[in-house]
């Protein structure tokens, strides 16, 4: 199997396997594996609520708790991305684990992830046309963090 | 230029450009770009200390502040990875931004990142031998999070 560097894509170079010779599934799986949620769900998956648990995975014990949302696109590599969604606008009190503390904001930590989209290659027609992997930056939220509100100068 | 799927590597499949025809620089740069640090700096990068700032980037405003340490390996794709290093064992008080609160732990959020290492392909000899990109999972810390300590049953 050859992944050809295609000079026709708008973002060069790009790997262009032909349509009838799809990219190996395993190769795509690797890319997918790199963006599984950082924190595996252990034990019970706690109901998505604005509270900091005393057990379970890190994202539910955090005082800026979050859940993971799956973002799947079969024409993208990786196909599966996970976005952290903050469950509270403010941080949860360390004392109670439930009441919010207005002194702290629960905010997402963003990251521009490089992804590739499968596109028809320029100038390729017919049934055996090649496909390009076109590079894009894609914004994902990795986690939620408890921060002190910004003080404007 | 062809990136051949090599059946000889212990971790299959792998792209194997020959040594004299290096992998396209741009393609590898893309991979590198995907793991630039999540949070861009705004204004001053504060000296590494256990305090939560009221301005600056998210990692210095967090009550579980962290710094980023560069991990570079020229035989890895991506070459540059960043590890979050927690600056405090406990969370910083939201009130003062400096005193630690023993009710909360500042802990790293770990993620098994997929990386590729360049290795000589099995059975390839001589000056024009091919190189494999061998898949590995590599543990990185993305950020530090303030959590309630785990209560053991």
């Amino acid at each position: 199997v050859s992944l050809r560097i295609q000079e026709g894509c708008s973002h060069l170079p790009s790997c262009c396997p032909s349509k009838e010779q799809e990219p190996p599934e395993e190769w795509l799986k690797w890319s997918s594996a790199s963006v599984s949620p950082p924190e595996p769900l252990s034990h019970t998956h706690h109901a998505e609520s604005c509270r900091a648990s005393k057990d379970g995975p890190l994202n539910s014990r955090a005082i800026s708790p979050w859940s993971y949302e799956l973002d799947r696109d079969l024409n993208r590599v990786p196909q599966d991305l996970y976005h952290a969604r903050c469950l509270c606008p403010h941080c949860v009190s360390l004392q109670t684990g439930s009441h919010m503390d207005p002194l702290g904001n629960s905010v997402p930590l963003y990251h521009n992830q490089t992804v590739f989209y499968r596109r028809p290659c320029h100038g390729e027609e017919g049934t055996h046309r090649r496909y390009c992997l076109e590079r894009r930056l894609y914004r994902v939220s990795l986690a939620c963090v408890c921060v002190r509100p910004r003080v404007m100068a | 230029v062809s990136l051949r799927i090599q059946e000889g590597c212990s971790h299959l499949p792998s792209c194997c450009p020959s040594k004299e025809q290096e992998p396209p620089e741009e393609w590898l740069k893309w991979s590198s770009a995907s793991v630039s640090p999540p949070e861009p700096l705004s204004h001053t990068h504060h000296a590494e200390s256990c305090r939560a700032s009221k301005d600056g980037p998210l990692n210095s405003r967090a009550i579980s502040p962290w710094s980023y340490e560069l991990d570079r390996d020229l035989n890895r794709v991506p070459q540059d990875l960043y590890h979050a290093r927690c600056l405090c064992p406990h969370c910083v008080s939201l009130q003062t931004g400096s005193h630690m609160d023993p009710l909360g732990n500042s802990v790293p959020l770990y993620h098994n990142q997929t990386v590729f290492y360049r290795r000589p392909c099995h059975g390839e000899e001589g000056t024009h031998r091919r190189y494999c990109l061998e898949r590995r999972l590599y543990r990185v810390s993305l950020a530090c999070v303030c959590v309630r300590p785990r209560v053991m049953a």
Partner: antibody, heavy 122, light 107 residues
Framework: EVQLVESGAEVKKPGASVKVSCKAS????????MNWVRQAPGQRLEWMGL????????SYNQNFKGRVTLTVDTSASTAYLELNSLRSEDTGVYYC???????????????WGQGTLVTVSS | DIQMTQSPSSLSASVGDRVTITCSAS??????LNWYQQKPGKVPKLLIY???SLHSGVPSRFSGSGSGTDFTLTISSLQPEDVATYYC?????????FGQGTKLEIK
């Protein structure tokens, strides 16, 4: 035109600290790592560490045993080197140097500041 | 740390001579080697990166070669403006390390 302009010469006593600045212009400051290199009189160049202005990611030469702190102010396109617990052997010229890279084959210091002479003497 | 050793430490040659400076690494560094030129009283300048690639604006009389542990910087025809100290630098691993320098003079 890429330029790195460093702060002026300093004279310090042993045990004191020094902070050297390096103002960058002519390129995207956050897009390139900044290295710091020192040259003691008659000695080889010695790499002290680097910082990525994008988020303050650092790598330090452990031979300096935690005495070095690198920071940046992206709003001013300025990098800073702070060296603590100064001793006489820290006397030398301190350079900031931008690191160019292609993401795969090379990392090279393609532009250098004019250097800051730091003299440590009692 | 990876140790870099240059030889000779100093040399004197005539204008038009072919000059060779060698650099040896304490362990294999593939081709991850740069050369810098520092003229007297001046700032170091990048000359060659990745063993053999000429930095922009560098005259073609300069060339580099080698791989693994042994590297060479060659000036095919020495010019008066080439008087300087030349340093090799490895970037395979942190900390980056430099050779002790080779001081080149004109006879």
């Amino acid at each position: 035109e890429v330029q790195l302009v460093e702060s002026g010469a300093e004279v310090k006593k042993p045990g004191a600290s020094v902070k050297v600045s390096c103002k960058a212009s002519g390129y995207s400051f956050s897009g390139y790592t900044m290295n710091w290199v020192r040259q003691a009189p008659g000695q080889r160049l010695e790499w002290m560490g680097l910082i990525n202005p994008y988020n303050g990611g650092t790598s330090y030469n452990q031979n300096f045993k935690g005495r070095v702190t690198l920071t940046v102010d992206t709003s001013a396109s300025t990098a800073y080197l702070e060296l603590n617990s100064l001793r006489s052997e820290d006397t030398g010229v301190y350079y900031c140097a931008r690191e160019d890279y292609d993401g795969y084959l090379y990392f090279a210091m393609d532009y250098w500041g004019q250097g800051t002479l730091v003299t440590v003497s009692s | 740390d990876i140790q870099m050793t240059q030889s000779p430490s100093s040399l004197s040659a005539s204008v038009g001579d072919r000059v060779t400076i060698t650099c040896s690494a304490s362990q294999g560094i593939s081709n991850y080697l740069n050369w810098y030129q520092q003229k007297p009283g001046k700032v170091p300048k990048l000359l060659i990166y990745y063993t053999s690639s000429l930095h922009s604006g560098v005259p073609s009389r300069f060339s580099g070669s080698g791989s693994g542990t042994d590297f060479t910087l060659t000036i095919s025809s020495l010019q008066p403006e080439d008087v300087a100290t030349y340093y090799c630098q490895q970037y395979l691993a942190f900390p980056y390390t430099f050779g002790q320098g080779t001081k080149l003079e004109i006879k």
